[in-house]
Interface confidence: low
């Protein structure tokens, strides 16, 4: 069956790294420079991705695979296949239209990317603050005072149901 199909379509014989050249009687021609074909039987080669500006080349383009980009120092990748480079900030900061800004009081960011998120509210889980939060670190919750007093139940009641906070990045 495969052989019959290849007789009907000579292009199916062209391997990755080549294209079926209609201008040359459907001969398999190598992909031109800066182009590739990752599968066989293709009638054109795709243009290689160029890693320019804030993008830098992580993997060079070959005749059978596209180039892969990452970001120059001070930037980080976002999106599938590093479709975006976003400026790094320091821990304790977030990126805004005006550049990197310190997290407001009551919020933190422990990464070089993303947004400042509110400190955990320990009291919602019936706990107390063991270690105070900073711009770079969340608070650390400890056992509630009631848990430490004699005669307290060892069964912790479930936390009240609440909508998880969104912090898209």
């Amino acid at each position: 069956f495969e052989r019959t199909r290849s007789l009907q379509d000579p292009c199916s014989n062209c391997p990755a790294g080549t294209f079926c050249d209609n201008n040359r009687n459907q001969i398999c021609s190598p992909c031109p420079p800066n182009s590739f074909s990752s599968a066989g039987g293709q009638r054109t080669c795709d243009i290689c991705r160029q890693c320019k500006g804030v993008f830098r080349t992580r993997k060079e383009c070959s005749s059978t695979s596209n180039a892969e980009c990452d970001c120059t120092p001070g930037f980080h990748c976002l999106g599938a296949g590093c479709s975006m480079c976003e400026q790094d900030c320091k821990q304790g900061q977030e990126l805004t239209k005006k550049g990197c800004k310190d997290c407001c009081f009551g919020t933190f960011n422990d990464q070089k990317r993303g947004i400042c998120r509110p400190w955990t509210n320990c009291s919602l889980d019936g706990k107390s603050v063991l270690v105070n939060g900073t711009k770079e670190r969340d608070v650390v919750c400890g056992p509630s005072p009631a848990d430490l007093s004699p005669g307290a139940s060892s069964v912790t009641p479930p936390a009240p149901a609440r909508e998880p906070g969104h912090s898209p990045q």
């Epitope: 804030v54 999106g79 975006m84 990126l95 805004t96 239209k97």
Partner: antibody, heavy 122, light 111 residues
């Protein structure tokens, strides 16, 4: 009055290149994020690329990644889109728009330019 | 295929109320990203109609309202008028794609 005016569209052969420009006026261009959005004839809207106020954050749709390059010149209040290796499916009206980004959960486009038509055909 | 799903068409008679839906997923609307709506009159550029789920820019009549719940959003137009005949698009941000995404658009016909 806030205004955006695109230029640079036209007829180009497959594999060719074009550079679109968008001249901004009536607002502080240098502190606003900007985007390009396109609309193929009779089709819907597709976000193409976006750039932050200082070019520190740049993004592309998968369909144009590696072929298109967005840039801006804040001293000239102008946004650019360099389009290489053009394909028939890139035929569309290209709009530039101010991207009102509220980092975290919201971004919207307002205002929009009138658009410039790019036709890729042999 | 658009990342956000809208009905291709909707219709109503003058004075009626019509609703246009926009359905997304856990990487866009469901992730907490806001939804915005645009009106595109024939032969013109899109115009912002609703931003941040329910806010109206100045100059947009209060006949237009927006809402969002879970992974979907809606645009409602009350007291339908002939000049409302246009294409309507929803838009949000997608964390998986790291970019803005649009619905396929809904053509509103005023009968």
């Amino acid at each position: 009055e806030v205004q955006l005016l695109e230029s640079g569209g036209g007829l180009v052969q497959p594999g060719g290149s074009l550079r679109l420009s968008c001249a901004a006026s009536g607002f502080t261009f240098s502190s606003n994020e900007m985007s390009w959005v396109r609309q193929a004839p009779g089709k819907g809207l597709e976000w193409v690329s976006g750039i932050s106020w200082n070019s520190g954050s740049i993004g592309y749709a998968d369909s144009v990644k590696g072929r298109f390059t967005i840039s801006r010149d804040n001293s000239k209040n102008t946004l650019y889109l360099q389009m290489n290796s053009l394909r028939a499916e890139d035929t569309a009206v290209y709009y530039c728009a101010r991207d009102r980004m509220v980092r975290g959960v919201s971004n919207w486009f307002d205002p929009w330019g009138q658009g410039t038509l790019v036709t890729v055909s042999s | 295929q658009s990342v956000l799903t809208q009905p291709p068409s909707a219709s109503g008679t003058p004075g009626q109320r019509v609703t246009i839906s926009c359905t997304g997923s856990s990487s866009n609307i469901g992730a907490g990203y806001d939804v915005n709506w645009y009106q595109q009159l024939p032969g013109t550029a899109p115009k912002l109609l609703i931003y941040g789920n329910f806010n109206r820019p100045s100059g947009v009549p209060d006949r237009f309202s927006g809402s969002k719940s879970g992974t979907s959003a809606s645009l409602a137009i009350s007291g339908l008028r002939s000049e409302d005949e246009a294409d309507y698009y929803c838009q949000s941000y997608d964390s998986r794609l790291s970019g803005s995404v649009f619905g396929g658009g809904t053509k509103l016909t005023v009968l």
